[in-house]
Interface confidence: medium
């Protein structure tokens, strides 16, 4: 395994809850350099498994706004622009990290939380169950 | 915006960087309740825009392991199982929050970071640019 020496300049925590409670710098560093997330912005409409984006807002959470994808159809859009029910539109899920204010309404105290979000939809071949 | 009354029981921060530096409870709460249980899926293989998952590991980041989707083809898989280049496989991207140890190798001091990850792929109709 990789052995990481402890940095001698680390902050020292005397907090009785250590290491459950730590200091986090919220001055967010954005690593999305040279990327253009806007490029994917119209995929929800152009996809053969199109989706709608629903705004999920929670002022007690950071980020407070999360967009949830909901597939528009059970089937997928075929070359004629019609829904083909021999294929399935399914949501692609991802577990993400958010911060929740704890206690509620506190500006400087949070708890880490994992939530499952649907990011978009993809078109899949269905699993056909044959009855014996 | 929504105005939230301050909870009188909030921890007080005397930190000179406040409100940039906050206390975070790392005892992760999992909100993936029974209403949204994780469904293990093989969508990456069954999709008309299939993808491979690549392991991105960074011991200084939480989560340390992130799986990145890379679309297998430029086109999409048609009903015959062949790649149709009249359609495009494109990655669905999402911006996620991660925690990075800061200073490096410190066990109890972190910084929030935003990174862009590809979660899966979807099949879209291409944008055709007509040359005058």
């Amino acid at each position: 395994g990789i052995t990481i020496p402890r940095n001698p300049g680390c902050p020292n925590s005397e907090d009785k809850n250590f290491p459950r409670t730590v200091m986090v710098n919220l001055n967010i560093h954005n690593r999305n350099t040279n990327t253009n997330p806007k490029r994917s912005s119209d995929y929800y409409n152009r996809s053969t498994s199109p989706w709608n984006l629903h705004r999920n807002e929670d002022p007690e959470r950071y980020p407070s706004v999360i967009w949830e994808a909901k597939c528009r159809h059970l089937g997928c859009i075929n070359a004629d622009g019609n829904v083909d029910y021999h294929m399935n539109s399914v949501p692609i899920q991802q577990e993400i990290l958010v911060l929740r204010r704890e206690p509620p309404h506190c500006p400087n105290s949070f708890r880490l939380e994992k939530i499952l979000v649907s990011v978009g939809c993809t078109c899949v071949t269905p699993i056909v169950h044959h009855v014996a | 915006g929504i105005t939230i009354p301050r909870n009188p029981g909030c921890p007080n921060s005397e930190d000179k960087n406040f409100p940039r530096t906050v206390m975070v409870n790392l005892n992760i709460h999992n909100r993936n309740t029974n209403t949204n249980p994780k469904r293990s899926s093989d969508y990456y293989n069954r999709s008309t825009s299939p993808w491979n998952l690549h392991r991105n590991e960074d011991p200084e980041r939480y989560p340390s392991v992130i799986w990145e989707a890379k679309c297998r083809h430029l086109g999409c898989i048609n009903a015959d199982g062949n790649v149709d280049y009249h359609m495009n496989s494109v990655p669905i991207q999402q911006e996620i929050l991660v925690l990075r140890r800061e200073p490096p190798h410190c066990p109890n001091s972190f910084r929030l970071e935003k990174i862009l990850v590809s979660v899966g792929c979807t099949c879209v109709t291409p944008i055709v640019h007509h040359v005058a």
Epitope: P19, E95 | N30, S40, S41
Partner: antibody, heavy 126, light 107 residues
């Protein structure tokens, strides 16, 4: 290839404590959790608790709360399980197991125990 | 706390036979159910993860199915080396838990 190597067998007196180590090699230690599972003679598997190595904190089964301490030392890539107030009921084989602890992305597992140590036999006898 | 129950407790099987072991959870756990095999004096070994996903190095005769509360481990064409105890394990919610085990022996 990840390997988990545990410390040797222990014989302890009732009321005493035991500390078992689990040395991990291969892969990045902070990328996964280490769980401890015990198995009494002729019995099934029992989850005792686990440590998130990145943050260094542990979760414990209610049954062992207050009696067990699970820690991880990143500098030596070693996890420890200390059990105090031993009784004859604690005679068992103690296993450490790797918990990949990865965020769900629709397919890859987040919490299966994919690698196990060889087990450490702890005998409590007067 | 999520309780897992397994059936049967014990199964004596002839080689090449099909073996089916079931695991029931006391509440919905999605697909966060894993199967392990343990041979005498050995550590458990992961067989199936997330209810139905194969694990590299595990023979294809082992398969899993189910979601929610009811899960099945199937061994299609038992071999002599498959003798041992099989455990299900849930990772949906802390504390994690194991089923009581199903012992499979060869006739």
């Amino acid at each position: 290839e990840v390997q988990l190597v545990q410390s040797g067998a222990e014989v302890k007196k009732p009321g005493s404590s035991v500390k078992v180590s689990c040395k991990a090699s291969g892969g990045s230690f902070s990328s996964y959790g280490i769980c401890w599972v015990r198995q009494a003679p002729g019995q099934g598997l029992e989850w005792m608790g686990g440590v998130t190595t990145f943050f260094g904190f542990a979760d414990y089964a209610q049954k062992f709360q207050g009696r067990v301490t699970i820690t991880a030392d990143e500098s030596t890539t070693t996890a420890y399980m200390e059990l105090s107030g031993l009784t004859s009921d604690d005679t068992a084989v103690y296993y450490c197991a790797r918990d990949p602890n990865e965020f769900w992305n629709g397919y890859y597992a987040t919490h299966d125990f994919d690698y196990w140590g060889q087990g450490t036999t702890v005998t409590v006898s007067s | 706390e999520i309780v897992l129950t397994q059936s049967p407790d014990f199964q004596s099987v002839t080689p090449k036979e099909k073996v089916t072991i079931t695991c029931r959870a006391s509440q919905n756990i999605g697909s966060e159910l894993h199967w392990y095999q343990q041979k005498p004096d050995q550590s458990p070994k992961l067989l199936i993860k997330y209810a139905s996903h194969s694990v590299s190095g595990v023979p294809s005769r082992f398969s899993g199915s189910g979601s929610g509360t009811d899960f099945t481990l199937t061994i299609n064409g038992l071999e002599a080396e498959d003798a041992g105890t099989y455990y299900c394990h849930q990772s949906y919610m802390l504390p994690y838990s194991f089923g009581p085990g199903t012992k499979v022996d060869i006739k």
